[in-house]
């Protein structure tokens, strides 16, 4: 969370941004809020990126002005125009690229004053893992798969029964490059699993951490997955 202040004569406005992460190939949002101003025509929003000449996006006089937009962002940005008057200057980013990572500035000017705040935008790939019982294996084993990760993550297994155990000797993890030659498919197989136990497959890089749990009993198999972005907020 980054709060910036700006001063215009006696007036300053608070601009707040949130560090966030973008998933390559999907849409992302660069979050920015400011003190609302009912005079829409008096609001100017400018998004800038460190190291880039030209603007990422500009909104002024109630409409977009993209005449100064840098070409790497052409056709890929939009503000939430109907939410500008309530203080939302967040930017929607289409088809996030690895090169979109960096430091962005959200600059605001209203009839009340002006202000700005920076945000760090990380880009990579992250996806939910899915664990299945691998019946093809000679011994009972579990297969954990996640379709898209970048940078290359670490993979670790854990078990409810054998807490603290190191499963690296009884697991095998591989990374397969996807067709776009950036992201990779993660596959990890855990061998010699026992019934009536809950196993967790944890995949983590510097952007996200994902965990897949599987509970295997004689009568049923229960699965749960979760994904959390790191260092955001």
């Amino acid at each position: 969370l980054i709060i910036g202040f700006g001063i215009s004569g006696k007036h300053f406005i608070t601009v707040t941004t949130f560090t966030s992460a973008g998933n390559i190939g999907e849409d992302g949002t660069l979050s920015c809020t400011f003190e609302p101003d009912i005079k829409l025509n008096g609001i100017v929003i400018q998004w800038l990126k460190e190291g880039i000449k030209g603007l990422v996006h500009e909104f002024k006089e109630g409409k977009d002005d993209l005449s100064q937009q840098h070409e790497m962002f052409r056709g890929r940005t939009a503000v939430f125009a109907d939410q500008v008057v309530v203080g939302n200057a967040s930017l929607r980013l289409k088809n996030v690229q690895l090169t979109d990572a960096g430091t962005y500035t959200c600059y605001i000017r209203t009839s009340k004053g002006k202000g700005n705040a920076n945000l760090e935008y990380k880009t990579g790939a992250f996806s939910m893992p899915e664990i299945n019982v691998d019946y093809n294996a000679s011994s009972e084993s579990l297969r954990c798969e996640a379709p898209r990760w970048f940078p290359q993550p670490t993979v670790a297994w854990a078990s409810q029964v054998d807490q603290g155990a190191n499963f690296s000797e009884v697991s095998n993890t591989s990374f397969e490059l996807n067709s776009e030659n950036v992201t990779m498919k993660v596959v990890s197989v855990l061998y010699n699993v026992t019934i009536n136990n809950t196993y967790s497959c944890m995949i983590e890089n510097d952007i996200a951490k994902a965990t897949g749990d599987i509970k295997v009993t004689d009568s049923e198999v229960k699965r749960r997955s979760q994904l959390q972005l790191l260092n955001s907020g």
């Epitope: 190939g25 999907e26 002005d65 993209l66 070409e71 052409r74 056709g75 088809n95």
Partner: antibody, heavy 119, light 107 residues
């Protein structure tokens, strides 16, 4: 309201060039990109190119060597030039504007202008 | 290039029928799919953008769904003015591409 009007169509001889205009009103060329799409008789839609608010362009690679788009913001007009025309370029040519700046669909279309390539 | 494959290519239906047209992208396009209606001699009209957003003034009987590679346009109850050709298109990556069209005819 938003309007796009194409002009410049007609009969063009094979090997010659074609220059079309798209006059826009109801929005600013500094806010939205303008797309060019064509439709051969009895066929489907084919995207050709776009000129963005900043003036930068993107082309369908299949037409890259033959296409040039430009615009004059003060005249609210976009220009489309295609060189070395052949019979298969016979089509109705449309200019269109995006529904949002992030390009989620083409909301506003011109009426189209018919270009016939024939000797 | 991303191929957009529409099915069926033609369809006969009656007024009041529920009609579904599908569009399959050759690779993931997120939700960047739009649907258009075109009548002979006229320019296409935008019905749905962003896969599921109905454009201003489009009747509520038109709806869109899908994400990734599989998309659907549904007309819940056909009206006489709905008989036309329908196209899907993707604006996720260049070159933007369209489906080959679905001609909807009166049975």
């Amino acid at each position: 309201q938003v309007q796009l009007v194409e002009s410049g169509g007609g009969v063009v001889q094979p090997g010659r060039s074609l220059r079309l205009s798209c006059a826009v009103s109801g929005f600013s060329l500094t806010s939205y990109g303008v797309q060019w799409v064509r439709q051969a008789p009895g066929k489907g839609l084919e995207w050709l190119a776009v000129i963005w608010s900043s003036g930068s362009t993107d082309y369908n690679a299949a037409f890259l060597s033959r296409l040039t788009i430009s615009k004059d913001n003060s005249k609210n007009t976009v220009y489309f030039q295609m060189n070395s025309l052949r019979a298969e370029d016979t089509a109705v040519y449309y200019c269109a504007r995006d529904v949002t700046t992030i390009v989620e669909g083409f909301a506003h279309w011109g009426q189209g202008t018919l270009v016939t390539v024939s000797s | 290039d991303i191929q957009m494959t529409q099915s069926p290519s033609s369809l006969s239906a009656s007024v009041g029928d529920r009609v579904t047209i599908t569009c399959k992208a050759s690779e993931k396009v997120g939700t960047y799919v739009s649907w258009y209606q075109q009548k002979p001699g006229k320019a296409p009209k935008l019905l749905i953008y962003g896969a599921s957003n109905r454009y201003t003034g489009v009747p509520s009987r038109f709806s869109g769904s899908g994400s990734g590679t599989d998309f659907t346009l549904t007309i819940s109850s056909l009206q006489p003015e709905d008989f036309a050709t329908y196209y899907c298109g993707q604006t996720y990556s260049y070159p933007f591409t369209f489906g080959q069209g679905t001609k909807l005819e009166i049975k």
